[in-house]
C-alpha cells in the first residue's frame, strides 16, 4: 500500500563501503545524500549506536540558488590506526523533519598478524618456587596459537601444542628469559621478552641463640638461592612500641630500624648496642648477586635486665648520738632494668660490716649499737634490679651533727612498719 506522503524514500545516494585491513591501517568511509531544503547534520552509527566523537567531515554543495533546491551532502568518517574496537557495521543517519533515515551498512573488519592483549612481564621469583606467566593474543584471523620460549628455546614441538594463555613454571634455579610467539594464518608475532630474576628464598627459622642486656645473638637457616651463592644477609631490629602492633608480615616498621649486615656463613649475628630490658622486633633477608630475598616476618625478642651501671648519687650521712641519718638519690647511670631497691652497708673501724635492704626508699635512720662511740663509721649504698646489685658507692664517712643543723625525726630501721613524719632536712 502506498505510504501517506511518499516521504519515506531514502535520501541516501551513496552508502558506506567496506574496509578490511591490519591493525594500524587508516581508512575512510563515505556516504552521500541528496535533500531538498536545508541540509541536515549527518551522524555516523557503529553497530546501531551513534558515534559521539567521530572523526567525520561534512561537505554540502547546493544544486541551485533557491532554498527549495536540492543539496548534495557528503560525510566522510576517518578511521585512524584501525583497532579491534573499530570493527563492525557502519551507517549514516540523518534526521529530516520528523523522520530518521539510515543508510545501507558498510563493514569494517580487521585481518592481520596476531595482536597481543597480554604479554609476559618481568618479575622476580624465589629460587625453586613455582610461578605462572601469561600471554594472550588475538586475530582476526583466528585461531591464534601460542608457542612459549625459555631462553629462546621453544617449550613445545609446535604452536598450539604446549601451554597457551598461562605457562606454569615449577621453579627456576637461574635467572631466565621467557617470550611467546603468536601464530595465525597471516604469520607470526613475537611478544616482548620477560626477564625472570631468581632471588634467594626467604630465610627460615630466625631465632635467638643467646641474650645479654645490650646484646642479642641470633641465627637463621638460609633459603635456596639457585646457582647464585649468598653474598650476605641483612638483619633489622626495631624497638617495639607497645601500641605499635608490628604483625607478622606488616610491611614497614614505624621508625628507622637498626640495620646490620652479616657475612655468610655462618648464618648468625651478634646485635650489640641494644637497650637492656627492652622489647625489639627483628627480621632477616639474604642477598645473592641477583638481589635480596623477601624479609622474614618480624620476630618479637627482648633483651634481659642488667644490673645498674652506677652507684646511687649524692649520698649524705649525718650522725647524732646513737642515730645516723643517711640520704641518697637514684643512680644517674642507666639502671638496665626495673629498680627494685637499695642495699646499704655500714662499718666502723673495728666492727663488722652491717648489710641492710632498704627497699625503694632513698633515706634511712640507723640506730647505732652501743653508746655511739664507734669511730670512723662509713656508709656504702648500691642499687639493685632483678639481675642483681649495681656497683657500691665509695664509702661515705659519717659526719657529726652540728647544733643548729635541722635534725629530722626519721623512721628507725628497727621499726620499719611504723610510719613517721619526714622533715626535708636538705
Amino acid at each position: 500500500a502506498p505510504r501517506g506522503t511518499q516521504a519515506e524514500e531514502s535520501p541516501f545516494v551513496g552508502n558506506p563501503g567496506n574496509i578490511t585491513g591490519a591493525r594500524g591501517l587508516t581508512g575512510t568511509l563515505r556516504c552521500q545524500l541528496q535533500v531538498q531544503g536545508e541540509p541536515p547534520e549527518v551522524h555516523w552509527l557503529r553497530d546501531g549506536q551513534i558515534l559521539e566523537l567521530a572523526d567525520s567531515t561534512q561537505t554540502q554543495v547546493p544544486l541551485g540558488e533557491d532554498e527549495q533546491d536540492d543539496w548534495i551532502v557528503v560525510s566522510q568518517l576517518r578511521i585512524t590506526s584501525l583497532q579491534l574496537s573499530d570493527t563492525g557495521q557502519y551507517q549514516c543517519l540523518v534526521f529530516l523533519g520528523h523522520q530518521t533515515f539510515v543508510s545501507q551498512p558498510g563493514y569494517v573488519g580487521l585481518e592481520g598478524l596476531p595482536y597481543f592483549l597480554e604479554e609476559p612481564e618481568d618479575r622476580t621469583v624465589a629460587a625453586n618456587t613455582p610461578f605462572n606467566l601469561s600471554c594472550q593474543a588475538q586475530g582476526p584471523p583466528e585461531p591464534v596459537d601460542l608457542l612459549w620460549l625459555q631462553d629462546a628455546v621453544p617449550l613445545a614441538t609446535a604452536p598450539g601444542h604446549g601451554p597457551q594463555r598461562s605457562l606454569h613454571v615449577p621453579g627456576l634455579n637461574k635467572t631466565s628469559s621467557f617470550s611467546c610467539e603468536a601464530h595465525n594464518a597471516k604469520g607470526v608475532t613475537t611478544s616482548r621478552t620477560a626477564t625472570i630474576t631468581v632471588l634467594p628464598q626467604q630465610p627460615r627459622n630466625l631465632h635467638l641463640v643467646s641474650r645479654q642486656p645490650t646484646e642479642l645473638e641470633v641465627a637463621w637457616t638460609p633459603g635456596l638461592s639457585g646457582i647464585y651463592p649468598l653474598t650476605h644477609c641483612t638483619l633489622q631490629a626495631v624497638l617495639s612500641d607497645d601500641g605499635m602492633g608490628i604483625q607478622a608480615g606488616e610491611p614497614d616498621p614505624p621508625e628507622e630500624p637498626l640495620t646490620s649486615q652479616a657475612s655468610v656463613p655462618p648464618h648468625q649475628l651478634r646485635l650489640g648496642s641494644l637497650h637492656p630490658h627492652t622489647p625489639y622486633h627483628i627480621r632477616v633477608a639474604c642477598t645473592s648477586s641477583q638481589g635480596p630475598s623477601s624479609w622474614t616476618h618480624w620476630l618479637p625478642v627482648e633483651t634481659p635486665e642488667g644490673v645498674p651501671l652506677g652507684p646511687p648519687e649524692n649520698i649524705s650521712a649525718t650522725r647524732n648520738g646513737s642515730q645516723a641519718f643517711v640520704h641518697w638519690q637514684e643512680p644517674r647511670a642507666p639502671l638496665q632494668g626495673t629498680l627494685l631497691g637499695y642495699r646499704l652497708a655500714y662499718q666502723g673501724q673495728d666492727t663488722p660490716e652491717v648489710l641492710m635492704d632498704i627497699g625503694l626508699r632513698q633515706e634511712v635512720t640507723l640506730e647505732l649499737q652501743g653508746d655511739g662511740s664507734v669511730s670512723n663509721l662509713t656508709v656504702c649504698v648500691a642499687a639493685y634490679t632483678a639481675a642483681g646489685d649495681g656497683p657500691w658507692s665509695l664509702p661515705v664517712p659519717l659526719e657529726a651533727w652540728r647544733p643548729g643543723q635541722a635534725q629530722p625525726v626519721h623512721q628507725l630501721v628497727k621499726e620499719p612498719s611504723t610510719p613517721a613524719f619526714s622533715w626535708p632536712w636538705w
Partner: antibody, heavy 118, light 101 residues
Framework: QIQLVQSGPELKKPGETVKISCKAS????????MNWVKQAPGKGLKWMGW????????TYADDFKGRFAFSLETSASTAYLQINNLKNEDMATYFC???????????WGQGTSVTVSS | EIVLTQSPTTMAASPGEKITITCSAS???????LHWYQQKPGFSPKLLIY???NLASGVPTRFSGSGSGTSYSLTIGTMEAEDVATYYC????????FGSG
Amino acid sequence: QIQLVQSGPELKKPGETVKISCKASGYTFTNYGMNWVKQAPGKGLKWMGWINTYTGEPTYADDFKGRFAFSLETSASTAYLQINNLKNEDMATYFCARGDRFYAMDYWGQGTSVTVSS
Amino acid sequence: EIVLTQSPTTMAASPGEKITITCSASSSISSNYLHWYQQKPGFSPKLLIYRTSNLASGVPTRFSGSGSGTSYSLTIGTMEAEDVATYYCQQGSSIFTFGSG
C-alpha cells in the same frame, strides 16, 4: 497497515495526573517522530510538540512547557503523554500523530478524551 | 510564531459545487512545509494534501492544493456530501501551527 492506537478516555480530578499511551504498528517506530495535538471541545487543533523516537529528545510548544511530558517505551513502540497537576483547561481530546520528513502528520491516533471534573 | 488565518470560517456548499478555502500565513513559508488536513465530526484529522499540492494516499483527485510564500489554497473541484468536514492548514516551517479551521 500503519496504525496508531491510543488508550481509552480518562476522567480525572483537578490536580491529578493523567498518562496517555499511543501504540504504533506497521512501521519502524524509531524512524518517525511522534507529535501530540490537543483539541478542546468545539475548538481547533493545537500542536503541543513532538518527541524524536530515535534519540528520545522531546520538544515542547511554548504553551505546553512545564506540566506536560513526552516519553517513550521504544521496545513496545509506544509513545506517552503525561499531564501533571490537571486543570479544567486541560479538558480536551489529545491526538498522537506520526510526523514525516516535511513535518506533515501522515497518520493519526483515534484520540483520547480527558475530562477534568471535581 | 507564524499565524495561519483561514477563510472563510464556515461555508455552505451544494453537491457539485467548486469550493476554495484559503490559508494566509503571517510570514513567508516554504511550500514544502504547508499541509492540509480534513476532520469529520467525531473523527481524527486525516492528512489530505502535503507539501502544498501533493495528494496523500487514498485522497480523491477532486481535491487539489496550490500556493506559495504567504498565500495557500485548498480546492474541492466538485463538492460531494462526504466532503462535509472541517479543513485545517498546518505549517512546519517554524514552531508548528494549525489554521483556525
